[in-house]
Interface confidence: low
């Protein structure tokens, strides 16, 4: 009987303190897991940085929404 | 649990007014923001800024408010809104109200903003 | 950008009627809305948030519906205690926004 995988936990334990332009941002992951200090948002760049963010700053909540709007148009 | 805004008065064209609001048994969680909303007599409600209450601070403004209106969180419990060159169409009662956050998950059916709690005004009247 | 637009701006009713009142989006929302009650002299009080959840304290005759960018509160079987004021409010975004209420709505309860 193999042990269970081990699947390692992406947490955010700072968040950035400043606005990240909306035309620098490609996609956003949510960061829920209750092993982790705090929810948030880790944004994925379009030159493939992943930035922590906190998903009670508006500007947080307008991207992502932005970024949903983005990919809803996407769908076939 | 109360908010108070204070610091109303007659002023005239061109002078500038700083309001407070002091909240009394109020969380200032980090989930709320401290916001200022206007309403000129018989008039609408007209929203003007909210800030961060948590710690990043951050400021909101109504496209209309941004370089004449400058809202700041001075203590864990007071907030204030700086007014400058001002004109007859300031002529407001001035609310102060906590925007609460309805934080649920996933986006976007939370994080829902909410004016549950509101002072009872202060008036600005600018005048010559 | 996320003007709101209510109707009527004015409704008379009897008592134990029905109010309806609408509130138009420019733009999509996602029930990210608010309905306010104010009574002369008053600060507003919140009543409905999330486009539909009723605030702690709220009568149930108070009901909030809506999607996109169309959203009402319908009052049934009003009281005279109901006369005020009502407000919409959308909180789906603070970029590039004028006002985040709508005009307001006077209901008269006769």
């Known amino acids: 009987q193999p042990d269970s995988v081990s699947i390692p936990i992406t947490c955010c334990f700072n968040v950035i303190n400043r606005k990240i332009p909306i035309q620098r941002l490609e996609s956003y992951t949510r960061i829920t897991n209750i092993q982790c200090p705090k929810e948030a948002v880790i944004f994925k760049t379009k030159r493939g940085k992943e930035v922590c963010a906190d998903p009670k700053e508006r500007w947080v909540r307008d991207s992502m929404k932005h970024l949903d709007q983005i990919f809803q148009n996407l769908k076939p | 649990q109360s908010l108070e805004e204070s610091g109303g008065d007659l002023v005239k064209p061109g002078a500038s007014l700083t309001l407070t609001c002091k909240a009394s048994g109020i969380d200032f969680s980090l989930y709320s923001y401290m916001c200022w909303v206007r309403q000129a007599p018989g008039k609408g409600l007209e929203w003007i800024a909210c800030?961060?209450?948590?710690?990043?601070?951050?400021t909101y403004y109504a496209s209309w408010a941004k370089g004449r209106f400058t809202i700041s969180k001075t203590s864990s419990t007071t907030v204030t809104l700086q007014m400058t060159s001002l004109t007859a169409a300031d002529t407001a009662t001035y609310f102060c109200?906590?925007?609460?956050?309805?934080?649920?998950?996933?986006?976007?059916?939370?994080?829902?903003?909410?004016?549950?709690?509101w002072g009872p005004g202060t008036l600005v009247t600018v005048s010559s | 950008a996320y003007d709101m637009t209510q109707t009527p701006a004015s409704v008379s009713e009897p008592v134990g009627g029905t109010v309806t009142i609408k509130c138009q989006a420019s733009?999509?929302?996602?029930?990210?809305l608010s309905w306010y009650q104010q009574k002369p002299g008053q600060p507003p009080k919140l009543l409905i948030y999330k486009a539909s959840t009723l605030a702690s304290g709220v009568p149930s005759r108070f009901k909030g519906s809506g999607s996109g960018t169309e959203y009402t509160v319908t009052i049934s079987g009003v009281q005279s205690d109901d006369a005020a004021t009502y407000y919409c409010q959308q909180s789906y975004s603070s970029s590039n926004v004028f006002n985040t209420f709508g005009g307001g709505t006077e209901v008269v309860v006769k």
């Open positions: 800030v961060d209450a948590g710690a990043s601070g951050s």
């Open positions: 733009e999509s929302i996602s029930n990210y």
């Open positions: 109200a906590r925007g609460i956050l309805y934080y649920t998950w996933p986006y976007p059916a939370g994080a829902i903003d909410a004016f549950d709690s």
